[in-house]
């Protein structure tokens, strides 16, 4: 798996560099996760034809993947820093169960899947430090998550492959929209 941000040999070799600001650290962390997703998508797309499939709607009905909408305050029209930050953190917390589902879905990229999951946990911690209104953040119910995980794992092979593809695609889009907004803060 790739080395987490801030721990690569370049960083060690350049101790005179300014430490990263909180915003830079978050930016770097998201880009690191996006790299991980890219590697996982490569394996998924090579293994099956899901990336070209037009039957996504069939599987999407079973999933309630977080998505960025205008009301969330993360787009330029109606941009609201605090509302947006709450949406980003809430969305990432909701994605955690889906990232857990991904853990046994990869053969050659098992470590990469773990790295994406762990890096997301770190990202959530970074963002929680940035948020002023932590009370507005709703944490998913563990019981609901456990039953969702069981349900997803009980799907047939085709649906499991499709679910994997959809989770990766949606998570990528969510992170891209999140970082777009965070770069305005």
């Amino acid at each position: 798996a790739p080395v987490p941000p801030g721990e690569d040999s370049k960083d060690v070799a350049a101790p005179h560099r300014q430490p990263l600001t909180s915003s830079e650290r978050i930016d770097k962390q998201i880009r690191y996760i996006l790299d991980g997703i890219s590697a996982l998508r490569k394996e998924t797309c090579n293994k099956s034809n899901m990336c070209e499939s037009s039957k996504e709607a069939l599987a999407e009905n079973n999933l309630n993947l977080p998505k960025m909408a205008e009301k969330d305050g993360c787009f330029q029209s109606g941009f609201n820093e605090e509302t947006c930050l709450v949406k980003i953190i809430t969305g990432l917390l909701e994605f955690e169960v889906y990232l857990e589902y991904l853990q046994n879905r990869f053969e050659s990229s098992e470590e990469q899947a773990r790295a994406v999951q762990m890096s997301t946990k770190v990202l959530i911690q970074f963002l929680q430090k940035k948020a002023k209104n932590l009370d507005a953040i709703t944490t998913p119910d563990p019981t609901t998550n456990a039953s969702l995980l069981t349900k997803l794992q009980a799907q047939n092979q085709w649906l499991q492959d499709m679910t994997t593809h959809l989770i990766l695609r949606s998570f990528k889009e969510f992170l891209q929209s999140s970082l777009r907004a965070l770069r305005q803060m």
Epitope: I30, R31, L34, M68, E173, Q176, S177, L179, Q184
Partner: nanobody
Framework: QVQLQESGGGLVQAGGSLRLSCTTS????????MAWFRQAPGKDREFVAD????????WYAESVKGRFTISRDNTKNTIYLQMNSLKPEDTAVYYC?????????????????WGQGAQVTVSS
């Protein structure tokens, strides 16, 4: 990195319109966030507008908001900048830029591919 090619620049009178296009041969064009920057003579290059992988997610510089519209057509590997109500101060070389992370933003450092630029001149 992808090759970017701008077109559609030219000379126009104040109050007129112009549409810039930026095309790439990249196979994964839809994965890129795309932007327009501009550089007026003797000035620094500045952000104009950008568009995420989701076409609804656009950002504009305050100076062009309401006059310029950025859009993309993934089937044609092309982004557009529709410029209306042009002003002499819009005169500049307009550059197209791409971010392979699909994120974008208002800073030049976020972009890893750049076009050669298209000259836009607005006469009064």
């Amino acid at each position: 990195q992808v090759q970017l090619q701008e077109s559609g620049g030219g000379l126009v009178q104040a109050g007129g319109s112009l549409r810039l296009s930026c095309t790439t041969s990249g196979r994964t064009f839809s994965d890129y966030a795309m932007a327009w920057f501009r550089q007026a003579p003797g000035k620094d290059r500045e952000f104009v507008a950008d568009i995420g992988t989701n076409s609804e997610n656009t950002w504009y510089a305050e100076s062009v908001k309401g006059r310029f519209t950025i859009s993309r057509d993934n089937t044609k590997n092309t982004i557009y900048l529709q410029m209306n109500s042009l002003k002499p101060e819009d005169t500049a070389v307009y550059y197209c830029a791409a971010d392979s992370y699909g994120v974008g933003g208002g800073k030049q450092e976020y972009y890893d591919s750049w076009g050669q630029g298209a000259q836009v001149t607005v006469s009064s």
